[in-house]
């Protein structure tokens, strides 16, 4: 039994880091493998992660962490029974994938303005709480070409757009994702999408 593709990990910079790797053949990850991880810190304990299958030869493990600070570094040991298959380390702050924003809501009752709001996925005491920026994706269910991205570079989790920038009388969907420049993170997954019917009064045309 050998590791074909070494574990790579990403952290949500709150409580979970996810590590994925590939074995050299079909493997029952949960019965055959264990990923041991420990914070490099005298006052820390060793933890064991039981991996799950992720395709035939792929494994994934969700490492639970109490919290994360930028200097944190973890040792990782992948075991198959008594055999050490791989040894490595992982610094969460260098591999951050933020949590996806939630509770995306479209408020359509604000005088021909669409107000989109969502929730910051982090609690106020987390470092990323004040460092997230967002991308909002709006698209038409009827017209695949009607697809747009709005970059929200301010901290408030909301976006206002004129309803008239979208077509009237048709349904739209929106979703939002986050990233943090300070840790050069990857983008989060998209939030679940929300749907609304776009209708607004056309301005009266004078001839």
């Amino acid at each position: 039994m050998k590791v074909l593709q070494e574990p790579t990990c990403v952290s949500d910079y709150m409580s979970i880091s996810t590590c994925e790797w590939k074995m050299n053949g079909p493997t029952n990850c949960s019965t055959e493998l264990r990923l041991l991880y420990q914070l490099v810190f005298l006052l820390s304990e060793a933890h064991t992660c039981i991996p799950e299958n992720n395709g035939g030869a792929g494994c994934v493990c969700h490492l639970l962490m109490d919290d994360v600070v930028s200097a944190d570094n973890y040792t990782l040991d992948l075991w198959a029974g008594q055999q050490l298959l791989w040894k490595g380390s992982f610094k969460p702050s260098e591999h951050v994938k933020p949590r996806a924003p939630g509770n995306l809501t479209v408020h359509t009752n604000v005088s021909d303005t669409l107000l989109l709001t969502w929730s910051n996925p982090y609690p106020p005491d987390n470092y990323l709480y004040n460092h997230l920026t967002y991308a909002v994706n709006i698209w038409s269910e009827n017209d695949p070409a009607d697809f747009r991205i709005y970059n929200v570079t301010y901290l408030e989790p909301s976006l206002r757009i004129a309803a008239s920038t979208l077509k009237s009388g048709i349904s739209y969907r929106a979703r939002v994702r986050a990233w943090a420049q300070c840790y050069n993170t990857t983008w989060s997954e998209w939030s679940p999408s929300t749907k609304w019917h776009n209708s607004y009064r056309e301005p009266f045309e004078q001839h």
């Epitope: 810190f41 005298l42 006052l43 304990e45 600070v69 930028s70 200097a71």
Partner: antibody
């Protein structure tokens, strides 16, 4: 208030073993690491090892790995250190000490925030 | 192991004056931009008591006349103005790796 109570003295013969106790009160015993520190007469401080009362995880200084055993009795909130094969070099004051972790955005710091009263161990034939 | 060397081994300071104690580490005790150095005071017949943690942070309840500074391998504890009750031995201690070690101590007396 937070207190770590240790017996005052232990008089032992070379080659014997001793079990030192440290009774904690005033805080959640199982939430904090407990350390043991040695201080020889008129000398500095030497870290022996630590134990987590909730998991029994232990770590030791190389100098004490083979002779020191750390245990916990959760029911009485008491930590114990057993030291075996005693010699005159083991004559010292032994302190238990609770540590506190301070987490900043950058790093995790720890220090000994509460010390026991100390047990004076004398090894003499 | 990281060796901490304190100097001077003893010093006598007049009341109201400044006491400066140095602690030099055999290798850096910094990591991630922070310094892992603590200072303790031990009075005769008593256990040690923390004064400063993370090089420069004053422990709660400790008078502001105690201050810590430094980074890397060089650290300093300052006491100003020195008072009668400060007669004690002072120890530095690093918390950067296993094992944590202490300096040899500096005995402060009043002139």
């Amino acid at each position: 208030q937070v207190q770590l109570q240790q017996p005052g003295t232990e008089l032992l013969k070379p080659g014997a073993s001793v079990s030192l106790s440290c009774k904690a009160s005033g805080y959640t015993f199982t939430s904090y690491w407990m350390h043991w520190v040695k201080q020889r007469p008129g000398q500095g401080l030497e870290w022996i090892g630590l134990i987590h009362p909730n998991s029994d995880t232990t770590k030791f200084s190389e100098n004490f790995k083979t002779r020191a055993t750390l245990t916990i009795d959760k029911s009485s909130s008491t930590a114990y250190m057993k030291l075996s094969s005693l010699t005159s070099e083991d004559s010292a004051v032994y302190y238990c000490a609770k540590s506190k972790i301070i987490t900043t955005i950058v790093a995790r710091h720890w220090y000994f925030d509460v010390w026991g009263t100390g047990t004076t161990v004398t090894v003499s034939s | 192991d990281i060796v901490l060397t304190q100097s001077p081994p003893s010093l006598a300071v007049s009341l109201g004056q400044r006491a400066t104690i140095s602690c030099k580490a055999s290798q850096s005790v910094d990591y991630g931009g922070d310094s892992y150095m603590n200072w303790y005071q031990q009075k005769l017949g008593q256990p040690p008591k923390v004064l400063i943690y993370a090089a420069s942070n004053l422990e709660s309840g400790i008078p502001a006349r105690f201050s810590g500074s430094g980074s890397g391998t060089d650290f300093t504890l300052n006491i100003h103005p020195v008072e009668e009750e400060d007669v004690a031995t002072y120890y530095c201690q690093h918390s950067n790796e296993n094992p944590p070690t202490f300096g040899g101590g500096t005995k402060l007396e009043i002139k």
